[in-house]
């Protein structure tokens, strides 16, 4: 019998608002034996995988997918499912990646980890989560 | 189908100094974490060094018999992988596999080996 | 690091036998274990990793157990081509380690 997979969580470093030009990584995890994670931007399809999984706890597993340079068109929605054997789980809350201007100030404060703030998310809509895994030629369209 | 072909292995004397390849087909390179893995003539498996993708800023890892002697690298624009060898020792002969890794640190993908022979 | 100890080096068993070959960690991997097996001249093969999960093509006569610090391959029915060596492998922290091997050989 197939076992039911958690959700996967999904958060970002350093936060989720971004001065322009500086990077962000957004971190999945989900239970130990994921083969791959998938990070998806507003909607199923544009997304990026990877299967470079690090051991994050005793009973999870996180991948991580860093921007280097954060752009106005990196703003929005995203959130994380991954893959393992034999099926893909639901869909993480979505996180909202906000991008503001370089010089900041007091009215757009950065949302550290940890922070009161917390990040913006709103409930996923799980109406269907059957995914094809890449390797079975879904088109991406990659987010960086 | 997953590829893995390594070249580069011969004879060398101790203290020289050798490159292993490592050419990646049939699945999307730069998405996997890759690994060296060595056997001696007769002997069990021992992890040498592994990098990581760019998401986690090309990380490398090594095995303390290695450790600033060998250099692992990557070159995701050709799908190749490295493995650099210095001042290498007779312990160091041994066959050398080029492992693309899973799960986090199961080695799921063997290429069929190059085989590195120190001596003088 | 992570001591990885096969307590059997070879077995010696006879077609159809139930095999059972054990691994021990130093200290807990948190079922952070793969299994795999080598022929004579081929490349070693995973067959289970994170302890229990059976690879793709694996026959299911194969399974694994266990968690902590210990952990078992177990094989129902040996086959004539199931003669090989069988290494465990920790993938919880690096640097990685491989238990000294399992050779099965046919009484």
């Known amino acids: 019998q197939e076992e039911d997979l958690p959700r996967p969580s999904i958060s970002a470093e350093p936060g989720t608002v971004i001065p322009l030009g500086s990077h962000v990584t957004f971190v999945c995890r989900g239970p130990v034996g994921v083969q791959t994670f998938r990070l998806e931007r507003d909607s199923r399809s544009t997304y990026n995988d990877t299967e470079d999984v690090s051991q994050a706890s005793p009973s999870e597993s996180e991948a991580r997918f860093r921007i280097d340079s954060v752009r106005e068109g990196n703003a929005g929605l995203y959130r994380c499912i991954y893959y393992k054997p034999p099926k893909w789980s639901e869909q993480s809350d979505y996180l909202e990646l906000l991008v503001k201007e370089s010089s900041g100030g007091p009215d757009s404060p950065d949302t550290e980890p940890g922070s009161s703030a917390g990040p913006t998310q709103r409930p996923s809509d799980n109406s269907h989560n059957e995914h094809a895994p890449a390797s079975q030629g879904l088109k991406a369209e990659h987010l960086y | 189908e997953v590829q893995l072909v390594e070249t580069g292995g011969g004879l060398v004397q101790p203290k020289g100094s050798l490159k292993l390849s490592c050419a990646a087909s049939?699945?999307?390179?730069?998405?996997?974490?890759m690994n060296w893995v060595r056997q001696a003539p007769g002997k069990g498996l021992e992890w040498v060094a592994r990098?990581?993708?760019?998401?986690?800023?090309?990380?490398?890892y090594y095995a303390d018999s290695v450790k600033d002697r060998f250099t692992i690298s990557r070159d995701d624009s050709e799908s190749m992988l490295y493995l650099q060898m210095n001042n290498l020792k007779t312990e160091d002969t041994a066959m050398y596999y080029c492992?693309?890794?899973?799960?986090?640190?199961?080695?799921?993908?063997w290429g069929q080996g190059t085989s590195v022979t120190v001596s003088s | 690091d992570i001591q990885m100890t096969q307590s059997s080096s070879s077995f010696s068993v006879s077609l159809g036998d139930r095999v059972t070959i054990t691994c021990k960690a130093s200290?807990?991997?948190?079922?952070?274990l793969a299994w795999y097996q080598q022929k004579p001249g081929n490349v070693p093969r995973l067959l289970i990793s994170?302890?229990?999960s059976l690879e793709t093509g694996v026959p299911s006569r194969f399974s694994g157990s266990g968690s902590g610090k210990d952990y078992t391959l177990s094989l129902t029915s040996l086959q004539s081509e199931d003669v090989a060596t069988y290494y465990c492998?920790?993938?919880?922290?690096?640097?990685?380690?491989f238990g000294g091997g399992t050779k099965l050989e046919i009484k």
């Open positions: 492992v693309r890794d899973r799960y986090g640190g199961a080695m799921a993908y």
């Open positions: 049939g699945f999307t390179f730069n998405i996997n974490a």
């Open positions: 990098i990581r993708t760019k998401n986690n800023n090309y990380a490398t």
């Open positions: 200290e807990d991997i948190y079922n952070r």
């Open positions: 994170s302890a229990t």
């Open positions: 492998q920790q993938y919880w922290t690096i640097p990685y380690t």
